[in-house]
């Protein structure tokens, strides 16, 4: 019962998690730009790993998305293919773990194919989390280094002078929701590992028994394979093979023609 | 790197009408607002007009009713159009743009300055 539970536990979280992935990689709100007051209209302006917005006092709102790869910061497409790897992981991995459950039945699946597909989505999930907090991770931190931030507050190009406005770029939405979207995802691949463990059929260690004959007296002790007959050095019944069972081996048996040991 | 073109500018008598451009290019991926500031001899520079990405429009107190601001977002560009033109008004003109230039880098952007002289 608590296998299914923490097994239907983990899946929930997972599913949560990813579902949160999905929507950080989504959104625009990875970067935010604080407002700047001009004095036409005060400029929001904030940034996704898709594309660019800029919002205005008045509610007017401008998207636009990066249609070139080529002027694109490498660190973006690291970030960029991070949550895709993510993404898709996660997905695969809930897609394993559906057919992995308890609760459910498909065919005369064995315990020991669903605890193998438990702990495949497991590991999915924990690589998808990760690849998730790493990507946000790599956002953030070049946020705080200035990645992409103009370096020259002023200079003079061809048409003018021109100015840097505004280098202060700080953490938007997004990547909070793929942090803790991440996290979750990672606990929800680590509660499938543990549920594994306990889908998973030991091999169950036979303790030796005998089973007296009721006319001859016979020992069986499954265990040892070597036979010895009831006379020389063997009349008293010591073992001559112990299996690692402790039941009944010192069970005093007449020596018969055949003692079975 | 983002340029400007101002063009229009000249020498027009009181009473007159003289309609200024400015033309923007390069890493754009905004422009949220564009407009005209002016600067006489001696004097600071101020605002005589600016429109936003939206439309929202701001004139100094100098020149409303007479000067009118619009611009084409196609061709990221911005116009003025000055009527009534009084000696006042002489100064030299610079194009402003606030744009939002590769990713992470808002830039206002000065024009070199076009002239416009009101003489009779």
């Known amino acids: 019962m608590a296998v299914t539970a923490c097994q239907g536990l983990g899946f929930v979280v997972s599913l949560i998690g990813i579902a949160g992935i999905i929507a950080a990689t989504c959104m625009d709100q990875w970067s935010t730009q604080d407002l700047y007051n001009n004095p036409v209209t005060a400029v929001f302006n904030y940034q996704g790993l898709w594309r660019s917005c800029v919002r205005e006092s008045s509610g007017f709102t401008e998207c636009r998305g990066y249609f070139t790869l080529l002027g694109l910061p490498a660190m973006l497409q690291a970030v960029r293919a991070l949550m895709i790897v993510g993404i898709v992981l996660g997905a695969i991995g809930l897609l394993v773990s559906i057919f992995a459950l308890k609760c459910i039945r498909i065919g005369s699946m064995e315990d020991s194919a669903k605890a193998n597909m438990t702990l495949t989505s497991g590991i999915m999930f924990i690589v998808s989390g990760l690849c998730a907090i790493a990507g946000v991770s790599v956002f953030a931190n070049m946020l705080v280094t200035n990645f992409w931030m103009s370096t020259a507050n002023m200079y003079t190009g061809m048409g003018g002078m021109v100015q840097t406005v505004q280098t202060r770029y700080t953490f938007g939405a997004a990547l909070f929701v793929g942090w803790v979207a991440g996290g979750l995802t990672l606990i929800g691949g680590v509660m499938m590992c543990i549920a594994c463990r306990g889908l998973a059929p030991e091999e169950t260690n036979y303790k030796a028994v005998s089973y007296h004959a009721s006319g001859h007296s016979v020992a069986y002790k499954p265990g040892g394979f070597k036979a010895s007959t009831g006379f020389g050095s063997n009349t008293k019944n010591k073992k001559i093979y112990d299996g690692g069972a402790r039941t009944e081996d010192e069970v005093q048996s007449y020596p018969s023609k055949h003692d079975y040991v | 790197q983002v340029q400007l073109v101002e063009s229009g500018g000249g020498l027009v008598q009181p009473g007159g009408s003289l309609r200024l451009s400015c033309a923007a290019s390069?890493?754009?991926?905004?422009?949220?607002?564009m407009g005209w500031y002016r600067q006489a001899p001696g004097k600071q520079r101020e605002l005589v007009a600016g429109?936003?990405?939206?439309?929202?429009?701001n004139y100094g107190d100098s020149v409303k009713g007479r000067f009118t601001i619009s611009r084409d977002n196609a061709k990221n560009t911005v116009y003025l159009q000055m009527n009534s033109l009084k000696p006042e008004d002489t100064a030299v003109y610079y194009c402003?743009?606030?744009?939002?230039?590769?990713?992470?880098?808002?830039?206002?952007?000065w024009g070199q300055g076009t002239l416009v002289t009101v003489s009779s």
């Open positions: 402003n743009v606030l744009v939002v230039s590769g990713i992470g880098s808002t830039l206002e952007v």
């Open positions: 390069g890493s754009i991926f905004h422009i949220p607002v």
């Open positions: 429109i936003s990405r939206g439309g929202t429009t």
